[in-house]
Interface confidence: low
């Protein structure tokens, strides 16, 4: 069978070889479609509701004005010339639409280094046969679930139309000291061959890297964290990262509530002070960071001075005082 | 021929609402994907919302949860209700119809939202 593509919407003509070119012609046109159920025969008398999909012409040809997807299928025709000579003609018809420009839609502006982010959706609305949608970095294809590159797909196809719309969700993890402008665009792949991509307008997000915060260090005085009841503890949150985070303080896992400080002063320590004590750095552009915790204990005079233990709860580096 | 109408762009306060409507002139609108597009200035055209002929919806990341694109196709109109309006939302916004597989592709002929104290 001879292979035909043919744009829905527009006309076709299927020769029928071997056919005189004018009447009286003794041929017939057989259809198997998505109109059909089996065979359906066509012949120069025409006439009928076929009229309006497809009619044969005078010289013997299979004429549809507008092409539908119903219309994919085999088409046959078998003709007999004045010497009594049979041709037969063999057609494999597959229909196509080329939809709109593909768009990118909820682009982000910025991604962040290091982490997944998504990049945007492409969308490609009236295609027939479906297609592919692929996305490319700087102009070179990206492969998907490969370094850091994650594509969600989702194919719909139109109730009435039976044309397809496809969507691609594009997630990357950019590398830490990449490209800080990177290029991202989409194109759409007819299902069809011969037909050239469609490609988006390109987008150019920018890439932020965070500065990972430095340990957040905590400083008791006096150091080890014993003192004497009445004495006076100051511990200290150390956070070199710029601006300056705001320091939160906790004891015993729960939130005390003091404004925000880098100093927690502690004076005239009674046995309520007592237990362990930690503080929480939150900057603006990163999660909360916690320091390891310290131990505030009271010694009675005489007492042995601290030795350094540790003990379970938290799960942070925990320094545990006698 | 296809003629998109624009209305319902002005002045408003940050946090205050504004509805923007398009009516479209012609038979075509029911099957036509519609999208609203607005250009701040000096900065490129951008999607800000789109809805397609069956009805489901895109929105540009920095306006989701605040703005809301919907179809009326007994009355060929297609709106952008906008809450919540922030100073960067100021901008011409544009309206687009797409139809015919991309074939056919008509703009509005845009409309100030202006978002200041």
């Known amino acids: 069978a001879q292979n035909i593509t043919a744009r829905i919407g527009e006309p076709l003509v299927l020769k029928c070889k071997g056919a005189p070119k004018k009447p009286p012609q003794r041929l017939e046109w057989k259809l198997n479609t998505g109109r059909t159920e089996a065979w359906k025969v066509l012949s120069p008398q025409g006439g009928g509701p076929w009229d309006s999909v497809a009619r044969v012409l005078p010289n013997g040809s299979l004429f549809l004005p507008a092409v539908g997807i119903q219309d994919e299928g085999i088409f046959r025709c078998q003709a007999m010339n004045r010497n009594g000579k049979e041709t037969k003609s063999n057609y494999r018809v597959r229909v196509y639409q080329i939809p709109g420009k593909p768009e990118i839609v909820d682009s982000a502006s910025e991604l962040t280094a290091g982490v997944p982010n998504k990049v945007g959706t492409c969308v490609s609305e009236g295609s027939y046969p479906a297609g592919t949608l692929s996305w490319h970095l700087d102009g070179k294809p990206l492969v998907p679930n490969e370094k850091g590159v994650s594509v969600k797909e989702q194919t719909r196809r139109h109730p009435e139309t039976g044309l397809f719309t496809l969507q691609s969700e594009l997630m990357v993890t950019p590398a830490r000291g990449g490209d800080p402008r990177p290029t991202f665009s989409c194109s759409f792949s007819p299902g069809l061959p011969r037909h050239r991509a469609l490609r988006t307008a390109p987008i150019q997000p920018r890439v932020w890297e965070p500065v990972p915060l430095e340990e957040v260090q905590l400083v008791v005085e006096p150091e080890g964290g014993a003192v004497a009841p009445g004495g006076t503890v100051t511990l200290t949150c150390e956070v070199p990262a710029q601006p300056s985070p705001q320091i939160h303080w906790m004891k015993d896992g729960v939130p005390l509530p003091l404004p925000p400080s880098p100093v927690l002063i502690l004076p005239e320590i009674g046995p309520q002070d007592q237990g362990t004590y930690s503080c929480v750095a939150t900057h603006s552009s990163h999660g909360p960071q916690e320091s390891r915790a310290v131990s505030i204990s009271i010694i009675e005079p005489g007492e042995e001075g601290p030795t350094a233990g540790s003990v379970g709860g938290s799960g942070l580096g925990t320094l545990a005082l006698a | 021929q296809v003629q998109l109408v624009q209305s319902g762009g002005g002045l408003v306060q940050p946090g205050g609402s504004l509805r923007l409507s398009c009516a479209v002139s012609?038979?075509?609108?029911?099957?036509?994907?519609m999208g609203w597009y607005r250009q701040a200035p000096g900065k490129q055209r951008e999607l800000a919302a789109r809805?397609?002929?069956?009805?489901?919806?895109n929105y540009l990341d920095s306006v989701k949860g605040r703005f809301t694109i919907s179809r009326d196709n007994a009355k060929n109109t297609v709106y952008l209700q906008m809450n919540s309006l922030k100073l960067e939302d100021t901008a011409v916004y544009y309206c687009?119809?797409?139809?015919?597989?991309?074939?056919?592709?008509?703009w509005g002929k845009g409309t100030q939202v202006t978002v200041s104290s």
């Open positions: 687009r119809l797409q139809a015919n597989f991309g074939l056919v592709d008509y």
């Open positions: 012609g038979s075509i609108f029911s099957s036509a994907t």
């Open positions: 809805i397609s002929s069956g009805g489901s919806t």
